[in-house]
């Protein structure tokens, strides 16, 4: 679809092309399974264009269908920590607030591996906060080429 000259001069956010790519900041304290994310040019190859961070969690500011993607690599990894017979070691991405919209969007398990990755298209609404929960005793890598999380607005 061709853009008019006026549209070409508008920032991407105003066209609805919200996009974010985040890197891991830290894990939560005991009893908090959430991963806490950070983004911005000063941190390297991470950025937010439209979505925003709320206490390390990604908040959507524009309704639409989004591509959500995530990769997590474990810094402490062993055959036991990734075995189904050990702890339930899963990564779940979901809408955690508002409570009325709470739902799991992605669920992945570490099966004999140190890295998991997935993506999906899903409708998201303004105000949705996405949480990434890592269950089990796991320590993810903070290397930016190993652990990252992002969203990309695709269409209304």
């Amino acid at each position: 679809q061709r853009l008019s000259r006026a549209q070409q001069q508008l920032p991407l956010e105003s066209l609805g092309w919200d996009i974010a790519e985040l890197q891991l900041n830290h894990t939560g304290p005991q009893q908090d399974p959430r991963l806490y994310w950070q983004g911005g040019p000063a941190l390297g190859r991470s950025f937010l264009r439209g979505p925003e961070l709320d206490k390390g969690q990604l908040r959507i500011r524009r309704d639409g269908i989004y591509m959500v993607h995530i990769q997590v690599t474990l810094a402490i990894c062993s055959s036991t920590s990734t075995s189904r017979h050990h702890h339930p070691t899963t990564l779940a991405v979901g809408i955690c607030s508002p409570a009325s919209r709470s739902i799991s969007l992605l669920r992945l398990s570490f099966h004999q591996g140190c890295t998991i990755a997935s993506q999906r298209l899903t409708p998201l609404a303004r105000g949705d906060t996405l949480c990434t929960n890592l269950t089990g005793t796991l320590l993810p890598s903070r290397n930016t080429d190993e652990t990252f999380f992002g969203v990309q607005w695709v269409r209304p």
Partner: antibody, heavy 120, light 108 residues
């Protein structure tokens, strides 16, 4: 300047307990995972235990699992190792060590170590 | 558990000579996650190399690491008097994180 200072070592009888401490300074303690590594006299280095920066994740070598407990107090910039049911083979110099920012357990700073001797 | 075997046990060399230290793993190390440390008597280990070949902050460029899979090498291009010490390799690709038992570099 990053500094790690261990304390709490000493002579203890088999079956006894000891609590090691590691006081950290010169870096944002809560940001970094930490480990304990030990070295028996004239022997190889052995990784003992690790803990995430937030304290939410703890990890142990099989040789100490169920006997040792790693913990941290980020408000005091201090790492701990509670050692119970001590055995003669636990005799070693115990080092606290800071993980790289990536969280991977290679150790860019070490303390000077504290000697634990388990003997009757 | 990955077993790391270091050789030789002792290396007798003179200052200015080249030192080549070997570390062999019992199985392939994930992503070449191998580190090298230097330890002098009565001191804590000091990180030299991580990721098999990346020099740690402040480490002189006479120290270099190489290798992949199961075979790794630490090279000291020209030995300085302060380089005589024990050198350990460590794998951190898989728990438990294991160390080799060291190579002692001594003055000939």
């Amino acid at each position: 300047e990053v500094q790690l200072l261990e304390s709490g070592g000493g002579l203890v009888q088999p079956g006894g307990s000891l609590r090691l401490s590691c006081a950290a300074s010169g870096f944002t303690f809560s940001t970094y995972a930490m480990s304990w590594v030990r070295q028996a006299p004239g022997k190889c280095l052995e990784w003992v235990s690790a803990i995430s920066g937030s304290g939410g994740g703890t990890f142990y070598a099989e040789s100490v699992k169920g006997r040792f407990t790693i913990s941290r107090d980020n408000s005091k910039n201090t790492l701990y190792l509670q050692m119970n049911s001590l055995r003669a083979e636990d005799t070693a110099v115990y080092y606290c060590a800071k993980h790289d920012y990536s969280n991977y357990p290679y150790f860019d700073y070490w303390g000077q170590g504290t000697l634990v001797t388990v003997s009757s | 558990e990955i077993v790391l075997t270091q050789s030789p046990g002792t290396l007798s060399l003179s200052p200015g000579e080249r030192a080549t230290l070997s570390c062999r793993a019992s199985q392939s190390i994930r992503s070449n996650y191998l580190a090298w440390y230097q330890q002098k008597p009565g001191q804590a280990p000091r990180l030299l190399i991580y990721g098999a070949s990346s020099r740690a902050t402040g480490i002189p460029d006479r120290f270099s690491g190489s290798g992949s899979g199961t075979d790794f090498t630490l090279t000291i291009s020209r030995l300085e008097p302060e380089d005589f010490a024990v050198y350990y390799c460590q794998q951190y690709g898989s728990s438990p994180f294991t160390f080799g038992c060291g190579t002692k570099v001594e003055i000939k």
